[in-house]
């Protein structure tokens, strides 16, 4: 049902819904302050645009009682409960932030008019894909897809010569929410990923992993999981793998390999690590100084849908348009905003851009180094390190099938 | 170290003024609390200023408290108004530790007597 | 509210025995819990933090267990220098408190 928006008369409300299953397991805590620390910028912002205007966040608690996992598995309703809330106390803001399950976005958005913005540090299924009023500030697993396809068909760059198109996926269900949802996507055999390759097969207990590291009849060379090291670790210890064995880690949402004296662990030298370029000052930044590196991108999402909104009303308001109407409900997309740290670009459909960063260990140093990088906005590769110090031979990666000449 | 001073004897309705002095470490890089003990009663949180000067008060204390923090010397205050006999209490400042999982330093508090 | 029910108010221990105290939250917070130990007189002194991560310097005999709204403290062989008053904390959220810290449990040392 409609409810009416406190989004008029130069006072204007976010609805942040701050639930118990969460896409991370972060306190609530942080994603406070980062929403006060988002409205301190807005509202300064505004100000110095001689928009003498009131901003303010309405945070909503789930009560607990029901959705009680503190994952997502159990956040399905949760959403609609919150909003069932607010609706009740007649307490809708100009823009909802949160949720960040995919389970509760997509139940929300199916099961509500939305006549109102809805921005989500998370929900990164395919089911979100493609909604006309969500914005999703955590890179979803269709642009995670997208990069996987562009690099398997590069061969043309020094340190891969060969088109891939085969793999395994690694898939045992104990993931986290992001990677849940990014394995699920590869997985998905009406996927774009899918799609484009050859053979992939999910492997999904221990054993079947640990036997493909040196399975002599293995179909393809390379392995696709998501985590950090010490999940590959747990899984391969010390294993002996064959040479031509590539595992793709994803990881996006860390940025532990960029910290000052981060040495990479033997066991990573087999490794290809997918991530997000670290922002540049957001190691270092007071925002971050209390927040784990791997939690860092997911209260920033927050901080970052204040500004976003921010954005949004200031335009909204300098042209004199009203912003309980469609258009601004819309209007979240196909734009770059200021972010807290940096410009933030969102896609047609309302989905973050990033930099995606491929690195590898170097045999020599033992240090991780950028082997190339990706634009999720033009969906295209940059390579970095033209002669990579590579454990596998000649410093090229292998071809994904043993024996398979050149391309 | 943290150490609380202001503390004594107060009337009802009067202001109160705490100041929470700090050393060894920067207030820009943690959250301070206040926290308060009732004679032979448990503990109970008062409010927070975090590294980034954003404040949270319990519900109870948001309308007659305010923290505020001076990086400089290295201070923390909270001033609250209107003061009745149940604000009696030992008023304890207390830092969270770096990655806000407890209050991992605390002052050895300052007692405020609430009497007419 | 993140409200914070510990149990029992008191308790009493012979030496070398053990105890247990339990404390539970009105809603799910993970495993942001901390314990702390507070004698007459003196300011809290933190024990466990994580729910189950011992402080620095405190002995091995107190565990902490538990995750979501369940929370555990357990003291084994009990010594007299454990006679206090132990609080547990949710570190969870901020905002929307009223007040934090559970109720406290007094342990007496026979």
């Known amino acids: 049902s409609q409810v009416s928006q406190n989004c008029h008369n130069g006072s204007y409300e976010i609805s942040v819904l701050m639930m118990g299953n969460s896409a991370f397991a972060e306190p609530l805590k942080n994603l406070e302050d980062a929403v006060n620390e988002g409205l301190e910028i807005v509202r300064g912002r505004l100000q110095n645009a001689g928009l003498n205007v009131t901003v303010n966040a309405t945070f909503m608690y789930s009560d607990g009682l029901i959705h009680n996992s503190g994952d997502c598995r159990s956040s399905t309703c949760e959403g609609l409960d919150l909003l069932r809330k607010i609706s009740n106390a007649q307490r809708m803001g100009c823009v909802l932030i949160g949720p960040s399950c995919t389970y509760s976005t997509f139940q929300m958005y199916l099961d509500t008019e939305l006549s109102y913005p809805m921005i989500s540090a998370g929900s990164f299924g395919l089911s979100c894909d493609y909604k006309e009023t969500l914005t999703r500030l955590m890179s979803p697993a269709r642009k995670l897809m997208y990069f996987l396809v562009n690099f398997w068909k590069t061969n043309d760059l020094p340190f891969k010569t060969y088109s891939w198109s085969t793999s395994y996926v690694y898939k045992n269900g104990t993931e986290t929410e992001d990677c849940f949802w990014y394995l699920n996507a590869l997985e998905a055999s009406v996927s774009y990923f899918s799609h484009e390759l050859g053979f992939k097969v999910v492997l999904r207990q221990d054993k079947e992993f640990q036997d493909i590291l040196m399975d002599h009849n293995r179909k393809s060379n390379v392995i696709i999981m998501c985590g950090g090291p010490e999940f590959l670790y747990k899984l391969k210890g010390d294993r002996a793998v064959a040479e031509d064995i590539v595992i793709i880690l994803v990881d996006l949402f860390n940025d532990q390999y960029f910290e000052d004296n981060v040495t990479a662990p033997d066991y990573m030298k087999n490794v290809l690590v997918l991530t997000l370029s670290p922002g540049n000052s957001l190691l270092n930044s007071s925002f971050s100084r209390n927040l784990s590196p791997t939690k860092r991108d997911f209260a920033l999402a927050y901080l970052n849908g204040i500004l976003l909104f921010g954005h949004m009303l200031k335009i909204f308001l300098e042209n004199g348009e009203n912003i309980t109407t469609p258009k601004f409900a819309h209007a979240f997309r196909n734009l770059t905003f200021e972010g807290y740290d940096g410009p933030v670009t969102l896609d047609d459909w309302g989905d973050v851009d990033s930099t995606m960063v491929l690195l590898y260990t170097s045999v020599d140093t033992k240090k991780y180094k950028v082997l190339l990088t990706y634009d999720t906005h033009v969906n295209k590769t940059y390579p970095v390190d033209m002669s990579p110090t590579f454990t596998w031979k000649n410093s090229k990666l292998p071809n994904d099938i043993t024996g398979r000449g050149p391309q | 170290s943290v150490k609380e001073s202001g503390g004594g004897l107060f009337k009802p309705t009067d202001t109160l003024t705490l100041t929470c002095t700090v050393s060894?470490?920067?207030?820009?890089?943690?959250?301070m609390n206040w926290v308060r003990q009732t004679p032979g009663k448990g503990l109970e949180w008062i409010a927070i200023?975090?590294?980034?000067?954003?404040?949270y008060y319990a519900s109870w204390a948001k309308s007659r408290s305010t923290i505020t923090r001076n990086t400089s010397e290295n201070t923390v205050t909270l001033k609250m108004t209107s003061l009745t006999a149940a604000d009696t209490a030992t008023y304890f400042c207390a830092r969270e530790d770096s990655m806000g999982y407890y209050f991992d330093l605390w002052g050895p508090g300052t007692l405020v007597t609430i009497s007419s | 509210a993140y409200d914070m029910t510990q149990t029992p108010a008191s308790v009493e221990v012979a030496v070398g025995g053990t105890v247990t105290i339990k404390c539970q939250a009105s809603q799910s917070i993970s495993n942001w819990l901390a314990w702390y130990q507070q004698k007459p007189g003196q300011s809290p002194k933190p024990l466990i933090y994580r729910a189950s991560t011992l402080a620095s310097g405190v002995s091995s005999r107190f565990r902490g267990s538990g995750s979501g709204t369940q929370f555990t403290l357990t003291i084994s062989g009990v010594e007299c220098a454990d006679a206090a008053t132990y609080y547990c904390?949710?570190?969870?959220?901020?905002?929307?408190?009223?007040?934090?810290f559970g109720g406290g449990t007094e342990v007496v040392v026979k």
């Open positions: 904390q949710q570190t969870y959220t901020n905002n929307h408190l009223d007040n934090g």
């Open positions: 200023i975090t590294h980034n000067s954003i404040t």
């Open positions: 060894g470490f920067s207030l820009s890089s943690h959250r």
